[in-house]
Every structure is written in structure tokens, then in C-alpha cells.
């Protein structure tokens, strides 16, 4: 039975040209995290394998930095980066947990972080 929950940074906003950290945290389970995949709609951004390290998709290699931790840093943001991002936790023995983050990249200099929320 899957008992875990993923806490994410929720709905977040950032300035064009700036950077943002995408973070998820898996709690309420003793399952071992073997890998976290970071995806944007239908695109793979990065993979963090607990043992093998990081894979960064070449399409994003100049704008994506691994970490902190299992998180992902997006740099040189553009308005086209606005959208849904998913952290997919591969765990043993539970299986897969998915968290969702919505990022809005703003033209203006006023970019405030939204509230944190949980996805079961």
C-alpha cells in the first residue's frame, strides 16, 4: 500500500531571465527513493538516480543545474518556461509517486512565491 505524500513548492512565479529551484519532498513512507525524474509536460528535463547520479537532457543542459539535493534549478528563465513541472519519485517497494509544480515566468519585476501544497 502506498502511504507516502509528495510536498512540492506548489504554484510559483519567477522573473524572466532569473532562476528558480524546483523542489519536491516525499514523506510518510519508509520506501527507498531509487530515482527522481523531472519532467515538463511531455519533456524529460533530468533524472537523479540515487546511486548513478544525474542525467541532464541535452536540450536543457545549458539552463538546468542539478540540485540542491533531489531538486532541480532552472536558469535563464523565459516566458516559454511557464507551465507544469512534475517530479516523479521511483521508490521501492511502493512504486511511483508524482508531484506537480506550476511555474509562471513573469515579465515584470514582481514575482512572488505561491503557497506550498501537498499531493497525495
Amino acid at each position: 500500500m502506498m502511504t507516502g505524500t509528495i510536498e512540492t513548492t506548489g504554484n510559483i512565479s519567477a522573473e524572466k531571465g532569473g532562476s528558480i529551484i524546483l523542489q519536491c519532498h516525499l514523506s510518510s513512507t519508509t520506501a527507498q527513493v531509487t530515482q527522481v525524474n523531472w519532467e515538463q509536460q511531455d519533456q524529460l528535463l533530468a533524472i537523479c538516480n540515487a546511486d548513478l547520479g544525474w542525467h541532464i537532457s541535452p536540450s536543457f543542459k545549458d539552463r538546468v543545474a542539478p540540485g540542491p539535493g533531489l531538486g532541480l534549478t532552472l536558469q535563464s528563465l523565459t516566458v516559454n518556461d511557464t507551465g507544469e513541472y512534475f517530479c516523479i519519485y521511483h521508490t521501492y517497494p511502493d512504486g511511483t509517486y508524482t508531484g506537480r509544480i506550476f511555474l509562471e515566468v513573469l515579465e515584470s519585476s514582481v514575482a512572488e512565491h505561491g503557497a506550498r501544497f501537498q499531493i497525495p
Epitope: 519532467e39 519533456q43 524529460l44 533524472i47 546511486d51 548513478l52 547520479g53 542525467h55 536540450s59 543542459k61
Partner: antibody, heavy 119, light 107 residues
Framework: QVQLVQSGAEVKKPGASVKVSCKAS????????IHWVRQAPGQGLEWIGG????????SYNQKFKGRATLTVDKSISTAYMELSRLRSDDTAVYYC????????????WGQGTTVTVSS | DIQMTQSPSSLSASVGDRVTITCKAS??????VAWYQQKPGKAPKLLIY???FRYTGVPSRFSGSGSGADFTLTISSLQPEDFATYYC?????????FGQGTKVEIK
């Protein structure tokens, strides 16, 4: 230039163990993960697992967990794959390969080590 | 485990032909796919990474495409040195798995 040089062919009896070495040169050994892939005669490729010399972490194909042990000796830039309780269907060519920087494809391969298991 | 199914398992072609090899994953693997070429008695060589990126030194006649579960390796004009076996590999999740191979033979 990047090189992965493997140890020579081995002939083993069923139930025995084999340890294959892979000597790396031409790159920073601790910066790349070393993987092991095998190929039975006339068959396709099968991933055994990978070892990250930097973190000391290893990932195994469950099929080989408990029989395969991946290690490294950083002082001599050498990776090892030991396979125990050998069976005849372990007869194969065993390759070591290096994963690319921040990528999970295998960009350089050793020449292969033939392991024959026969009574 | 994710299964990678290649087709065809073998094909006969002539120098100059356009050759297409397909690889189907048993689940969505996004673009986490590489293609390798292997000649008899030799180790595999990386051709394409992340589904569509040509590896350093690989001739431009080799191209890769696809995303999700369906991937293609294309050789635009087959050369004598291209007769070999080709494998796809997924690294979306462990265990990494390979297709069974496609042998490209001389017609």
C-alpha cells in the same frame, strides 16, 4: 585518449566465481560511472549494473543482485565486476562501459572479456 | 522492467539505401533512449543519445527521432561500413534495458 582495458578471457566451472577488471585511462575516473553489460553468444545486450566511483553508490539489475558485485579501486583507476555461483548460461562476453558526463548513455566501452562456464 | 522491442530483427539492404529501424518501449520513456552500433567481435559504439542527438564523430547520415514510446534510427544512405547490428537502450529507469538488436545485412 579515453581507454577502458579489460582483463583476459576466463574459463570457470559451474558454481565458481569470476572477477573481471576494467582499467580506465584518459579521463578523470571518479567523474564518471562505470557500467557492466554482458552479451551471451549470438544474443543481445544485458545491463548488469553501474558503480559511481565518486559517491561509492552502485545500482544493480535485480536479476544479478546477490550474485554480482561491482567495486572500484580509485588508486589504480580500475573497476571490477565479480559474478558468483556461475552457471552455464553466464557464458558471455562481459563489457565495462563509461557513462557520459551528466548523461546516462554509454560513450566508451572496453574490448570485452569472454567468460566461459563449463564443467 | 521496461521492454524495448526493435523491428525488424534483421534486414537486407544495398549500399545507398535508406534504412529505418524502429524501437518501441513498453511504457513512456520520454527521450531517454540511446542507439548503438555493434560489429562482430567488437564492443558497441554510441551513435545517438537522448533519442535525437548525434554523438561526436558519428556521420550525419545517422539520425534518431522519437519521444514517448516510439523511436526510430535512420541511415539516410547506407555505406559499406554500416553493415552491423544496431541496439536501442532506455535509461528512463533502472534496470536499463536494450532492444534485442537489428542486424543490417548486405543484399
Amino acid at each position: 585518449q579515453v581507454q577502458l582495458v579489460q582483463s583476459g578471457a576466463e574459463v570457470k566451472k559451474p558454481g565458481a566465481s569470476v572477477k573481471v577488471s576494467c582499467k580506465a585511462s584518459g579521463f578523470t575516473f571518479t567523474g564518471r560511472t562505470i557500467h557492466w553489460v554482458r552479451q551471451a553468444p549470438g544474443q543481445g545486450l544485458e545491463w548488469i549494473g553501474g558503480f559511481n566511483p565518486n559517491s561509492g553508490g552502485s545500482s544493480y539489475n535485480q536479476k544479478f543482485k546477490g550474485r554480482a558485485t561491482l567495486t572500484v579501486d580509485k588508486s589504480i583507476s580500475t573497476a571490477y565486476m565479480e559474478l558468483s555461483r556461475l552457471r552455464s548460461d553466464d557464458t558471455a562476453v562481459y563489457y565495462c562501459a563509461r557513462s557520459s558526463y551528466y548523461r546516462f548513455d554509454l560513450d566508451y566501452w572496453g574490448q570485452g572479456t569472454t567468460v566461459t562456464v563449463s564443467s | 522492467d521496461i521492454q524495448m522491442t526493435q523491428s525488424p530483427s534483421s534486414l537486407s539492404a544495398s549500399v545507398g539505401d535508406r534504412v529505418t529501424i524502429t524501437c518501441k518501449a513498453s511504457q513512456d520513456v520520454k527521450t531517454a533512449v540511446a542507439w548503438y552500433q555493434q560489429k562482430p567481435g567488437k564492443a558497441p559504439k554510441l551513435l545517438i543519445y537522448s533519442a535525437s542527438f548525434r554523438y561526436t564523430g558519428v556521420p550525419s547520415r545517422f539520425s534518431g527521432s522519437g519521444s514517448g514510446a516510439d523511436f526510430t534510427l535512420t541511415i539516410s544512405s547506407l555505406q559499406p561500413e554500416d553493415f552491423a547490428t544496431y541496439y536501442c537502450q532506455q535509461h528512463y529507469t533502472t534496470p536499463w534495458t536494450f532492444g534485442q538488436g537489428t542486424k543490417v545485412e548486405i543484399k
